[in-house]
Interface confidence: low
């Protein structure tokens, strides 16, 4: 979870962050879309067992216990049906909590774009967040860092990616000289553009920040009608939802 | 030279169906999406839809949703346009338009067919 | 959906002149916004997009300006190839929509 270029927030300012856990070490960050639902990206789920998976809520530095921190246990996981590990596309899944969220100062929601929202323009400012390395060298962060970046050019992006991008995908820049971006482990982190959760961060290059492989998100417009089908079949009582992966040793 | 060509148009009656083409040469056709847009008779724009051919994802104007439907056959480099259930309001010349991305904007719709001329009439 | 106004719906103007036209979204649509030109029979041709952005092969009198609500399109000496019908569209959100269209006619 690599935020390069990057500053620390002023804790808890960004409420919807999600710390993805497993065996006890940080994941992959998500967002909160509902009291029981978080967003995040596939891959961060392949080859997992969910029963060692933990959502943490309302932290800002994972590695103390903070009263504001809300941790629970995942019910369920609904990867997009399109998903494809070796390109990414499709990077998408739905988190359901084994309980609901309390809604506080901590702890809050995050939109996704409208139903019929085009993604983000070229040029536009945004901030991606994550909880991992602030350098190539693993060096841990204070707390949740964030970086602001712009929207880059699809057609500039694909090339740079030598035409492997799907048009569901979403790239950033710096904006300028510096270094500036995610990598791979701030995986389904959102990118946070107008004050909703346009894109979720799916890959980037080897090295942090590197303008030739510009950093690549999950368009999550492109995704808002799969999102809320899956939130709306959800029933209200314990249980898999249609199409969903419960925790291996768990009955159905 | 990117060319957009598109046929299909002509006189039907209320209730009737219709399918227009667009057969796109020049680019890569799957890398970008494709519009309709149509023009009534002295009259402006109006989107109608668009498909990114590459996945095949549409999407409509409200006025259309649920009787026309914008399809591709990537092998052909053509979209269609299906119009069903047909009314003397869709009378309009139709254009496709190839939908390019651009810097700080999406949709632009940098080439146009020549346009077909649909007539709804008894 | 986004309405796009244009103003004036049509002008008369000279070769040479220097033309304004303004299109108002309601509401905030960035830069997302392109200029088209007509003329009868034809199709619509790109000019100007993001709102600034001269189009390949569009002669630099051509210009655009504006974002948020408030853009504009200026021919800076109208030649007699400019009188036709334009258009502006808004690629913000879907569906993308079109002013009414400016109609230059000549003096």
């Known amino acids: 979870a690599q935020i390069i270029g990057g500053h620390e927030v002023t804790p808890h300012s960004r409420p919807y962050m999600a710390s993805v856990r497993f065996g006890g070490q940080h994941h992959c960050g998500g967002f909160l879309l509902r009291a029981r639902w978080v967003v995040s990206a596939a891959h961060c789920f392949s080859h997992r067992d969910l029963r060692t998976g933990l959502v943490v809520l309302g932290a800002h530095v994972l590695s103390t216990a903070e009263p504001t921190q809300q941790v629970f246990g995942i019910d369920a996981l609904t990867t997009h049906p399109d998903y494809h590990p070796m390109t990414h596309a499709n990077d998408i899944c739905l988190l359901r909590l084994n309980g609901s969220a309390v809604l506080g100062p901590a702890v809050g929601l995050l939109r996704p774009p409208g139903r019929r929202a085009r993604p983000p323009t070229a040029g536009t400012r945004c901030r991606v967040a994550g909880w991992g390395f602030v350098s190539d060298f693993e060096e841990l962060p204070p707390g949740l860092m964030e970086a602001k970046v712009r929207v880059l050019d699809p057609d500039v992006c694909n090339s740079s990616w030598k035409g492997h991008l799907t048009l569901t995908m979403l790239c950033t820049r710096s904006g300028d000289s510096h270094r500036r971006g995610f990598c791979s482990a701030d995986s389904g982190g959102p990118l946070v553009c107008r004050n909703r959760a346009h894109g979720l961060v799916s890959f980037s290059g080897l090295w942090c920040g590197d303008p030739k492989t510009p950093d690549v998100y999950t368009q999550v417009s492109a995704f808002v009608a799969w999102i809320w089908d899956v939130v709306r079949r959800s029933s209200p009582q314990p249980g898999p939802l249609p199409g969903t992966t419960r925790p291996p040793g768990e009955a159905a | 030279e990117v060319q957009l060509v598109e046929s299909g148009g002509g006189l039907v009656q209320p209730g009737g169906s219709l399918r227009l083409s667009c057969a796109a040469s020049?680019?890569?056709?799957?890398?970008?999406?494709i519009s309709w847009v149509r023009q009534a008779p002295g009259k402006g724009l109006e989107w109608v839809g668009e498909?990114?051919?590459?996945?095949?994802?549409?999407d409509y104007a409200d006025s259309v949703k649920g009787r026309f439907t914008i399809s591709a056959d990537t092998s052909k480099n053509t979209a269609y346009l299906q119009m069903n259930s047909l009314r003397a309001e869709d009378t309009a010349v139709y254009y496709c338009a190839r939908v390019k991305w651009a810097v700080s904007s999406l949709g632009v719709m940098d080439y146009w067919g020549q346009g077909t001329l649909v007539t709804v009439s008894s | 959906d986004i309405q796009m106004t244009q103003s004036p719906s049509s002008l008369s103007a000279s070769v040479g002149d220097r033309v304004t036209i303004t299109c108002r979204a309601s509401?905030?649509?960035?830069?997302?916004v392109a200029w088209y030109q007509q003329k009868p029979g034809k199709a619509p041709k790109l000019l100007i997009y993001?709102?600034?952005f001269l189009y390949s092969g569009v002669p630099s009198r051509f210009s655009g300006s504006g974002s948020g609500t408030d853009f504009t399109l200026t021919i800076s000496s109208l030649q007699p190839e400019d009188f036709a019908t334009y258009y502006c569209?808004?690629?913000?959100?879907?569906?993308?929509?079109f002013g009414q269209g400016t109609k230059v006619e000549i003096k």
């Open positions: 020049g680019f890569t056709f799957s890398s970008t999406a």
């Open positions: 509401q905030d649509v960035s830069t997302a």
């Open positions: 993001s709102a600034s």
């Open positions: 498909i990114y051919p590459s996945d095949g994802y549409t």
């Open positions: 569209q808004q690629s913000y959100t879907t569906p993308p929509t």
